[in-house]
């Protein structure tokens, strides 16, 4: 799994846009089975916040044991706390489930910082505010962990929604979503609307607040505005995509587009930040610093270590630039762009000092494992993980935080040549390349 404020462990060659309009596929295409526009029972089924992750309620076992489970598109294991831990209010008790089956196999998942390990089994799983189905799924019962569970996060497990290729211990362990699609009539697609609050939430506020929606098996048209634009899933392991151009306030970073995807670019709801490869991060920060130079910030702010606080109500959003990522489109030589605001990449944090300050951390950070479009990106958009058609859709989220002057955007089409050259081909060595 990716790392660096990676939850749960964790806190180009593109040409300039041209006037030429290319045909595009949006939701004008025929509706497919299961893609009806309203999924009332699933709307608002997520809670949480970007810094600690978004979670959905799930039940495991017979009789059902209710747990809150982190929604993570950057991993592929369904793993739940199965032993007492100081940060867990509750945990999966296998001995109380009549439907639990032991697979007599262990699993060990190390991260750059921390790890979890456990025992593999299967049990009956359902999602109360999801499709009305029960599936037998693989479950890693976490018996030991280090720096995995987050104090006060209110989740007790993780739902890895990516593909089998990155499942642990190996790709033979079927991920939950594969099991769901195989055993039911749920279409092979899910969509996420993560709603950042725009201000820090204390524990009781998180419990009371809506964090967003995970629509399993379809698209809910009430959760977005405008059109959905799709980018191909380059390879089915992580949700890998290709970025072809990056702009800060409309100014092209002018880097070889391979740099943007070195060594990959993924969409990951389990990572807090927008994480960028070192060279790209440095160029982006230089550009953001220049745009916001009317204010002086400590170096630690740009490293994500230090918060800055404005008098409550006076955050100068206007001095910070918008950031646009151009993604490969579905049509040859066509791209589209997603644009986020500082309201997404400045993450509100509780200041211990005073409630009369609005404090933020810079939520763009450096990565050694490629670009990670984490919660700060996803909070601007409704994101459709269309596994059936091997593509990811983006539309402006109906719940994104903005001001009266600017809004997040999804726009296209733009003519961009040689986009295939933007992808980086990771040298194939052994399986240890997945160890991060």
């Amino acid at each position: 799994t990716q790392h660096g404020i990676r939850l749960p462990l964790r806190s180009g060659l593109g040409g300039a846009p041209l006037g030429l309009r290319l045909p595009r596929e949006t939701d004008e295409e025929p509706e497919e089975p299961g893609r009806r526009g309203s999924f009332v029972e699933m709307v608002d089924n997520l809670r949480g916040k970007s810094g600690q992750g978004y979670y959905v309620e799930m039940t495991v076992g017979s009789p059902p044991q209710t747990l809150n489970i982190l929604v993570d598109t950057g991993s592929s294991n369904f793993a739940v706390g199965a032993a007492p831990h100081p940060f867990l209010h509750r945990y999966y008790q296998r001995q109380l489930s009549s439907t639990y089956r032991d697979l007599r196999k262990g699993v060990y998942v190390p991260y750059t910082q921390g790890k979890w390990e456990g025992e593999l089994g299967t049990d009956l799983v359902s999602i109360p505010h999801g499709p009305n189905v029960t599936v037998r799924a693989n479950i890693a019962a976490i018996t030991e962990s280090d720096k995995f569970f987050i104090n006060g996060s209110n989740w007790e497990g993780i739902l890895g929604l990516a593909y089998a290729e990155i499942a642990r211990p190996d790709d033979s362990l079927e991920p939950f979503f594969d099991s769901l699609v195989k055993q039911t009539h749920v279409p092979n697609l899910f969509s996420l609307q993560l709603c950042g609050a725009g201000f820090p939430l204390n524990q009781s506020e998180v419990l009371a607040s809506v964090g967003g929606s995970m629509i399993i098996g379809g698209i809910d048209h009430s959760l977005y505005t405008g059109s959905l634009w799709y980018t191909p899933i380059r390879r089915e392991w992580y949700y890998e995509v290709i970025i072809v151009r990056v702009e800060i306030n409309g100014q092209d970073l002018k880097m070889d587009c391979k740099e943007y995807n070195y060594d990959k670019s993924i969409v990951d709801s389990g990572t807090t930040n927008l994480r960028l490869p070192k060279k790209v991060f440095e160029a982006a920060v230089k550009s953001i610093k220049a745009a916001s130079s009317t204010e002086k910030f400590p170096d630690g702010f740009w490293l994500g270590e230090q918060l800055v606080c404005w008098q409550a109500g006076t955050t100068p959003w206007n001095i910070f630039p918008v950031i646009s990522l151009y993604l490969m489109g579905e049509v040859t030589n066509q791209s589209f762009r997603i644009t986020i605001l500082p309201q997404q990449y400045l993450r509100p944090v509780e200041d211990v000092a005073t409630s009369q300050d609005d404090c933020y951390k810079f939520a763009i950070s450096q990565s050694s494992t490629g670009t990670v479009m984490g919660a700060v990106i996803m909070e601007g958009f409704y994101v459709v993980f269309d596994r059936a058609r091997k593509r990811i859709g983006f539309a402006v989220s109906a719940c994104h935080v903005h001001d009266e002057f600017r809004t997040a955007a999804v726009e296209g089409p733009f003519v961009t040549l040689d986009m295939e050259d933007c992808g980086y081909n990771i040298p194939q060595t052994d399986e240890s390349t997945l160890m991060t």
Epitope: F297, P298, C309, W310, Q311, T314, A353
Partner: antibody, heavy 119, light 107 residues
């Protein structure tokens, strides 16, 4: 030019009330918080608290809760410090200071108002 | 409360000298430190904030440095007008506290 102009010196008796004004100019008053700092004769600087000039909400340091009150007259770009039930220990120079933009450093200061409490 | 200790109450110097005034915090204040200069009968003037950022109009002979708990204000070449009282202040958490001050005087 940014300026913070404080009211003149005050001579008060114990038990009385004093109200000091701090009139600002040269910037948007409601964008920057206003801090109050006490300096007793021959002593160092002590942070009394601050007031959010956008919301009007005051924050007091523990040692100054109870008898001190910060207020605003936004239309006049003026902040006020009132100290009730004065004691001899309140004899000091009081400074208003504009809080910095991104943190609580104090970038511009008034000239200070000396308050003497004596029976 | 975070305590700031300026170990030298007085420092003697000569015009043209390089002088360093130190400030130690009782806990890590993550470079949230400011420095002020105060002359007799005047209000303090901000010199440095965020440990090393020079305030508008402050001569470049004044530099701030440090991290964690240890911070320094350096005057590269002392001028006669620099003889004054210098205070450090932490803007990390409430209550925002000041050091006891260091008086820079002529030898």
């Amino acid at each position: 030019e940014i300026q913070l102009q404080q009211s003149g010196p005050e001579l008060k008796k114990p038990g009385e009330t004093v109200k000091i004004s701090c009139k600002t100019s040269g910037y948007t008053f409601t964008t920057y918080g206003m801090t109050w700092v006490k300096q007793a004769p021959g002593k160092g600087l002590k942070w009394m608290g601050w007031i959010n000039t956008y919301s009007g909400v005051p924050i007091y340091a523990d040692d100054f809760k109870g008898r001190s009150a910060f207020s605003l007259e936004t239309s006049a770009s003026t902040a006020y410090l009132q100290i009730n039930n004065l004691e001899n220990e309140d004899t000091a120079t009081y400074f208003c200071a504009r809080r910095g933009s991104t943190a609580h450093y104090f970038d511009y200061w008034g000239q200070g108002t000396t308050v003497t409490v004596s029976s | 409360d975070i305590v700031l200790t300026q170990s030298h109450k007085f420092m003697s110097t000569s015009v043209g000298d390089r002088v360093s005034i130190t400030c130690k915090a009782s806990q890590d204040v993550s470079t949230a430190v400011a420095w002020y200069q105060q002359k007799p009968g005047q209000s303090p003037k901000l010199l440095i904030y965020w440990a090393s950022t020079r305030h508008t109009g402050v001569p470049d002979r004044f530099t701030g440095s440090g991290s964690g708990t240890d911070y320094t204000l350096t005057i590269s070449s002392v001028q006669a007008e620099d003889l004054a009282l210098y205070y450090c202040q932490q803007h990390y958490s409430t209550p925002y506290t000041f050091g006891g001050g260091t008086k820079l005087e002529l030898k």
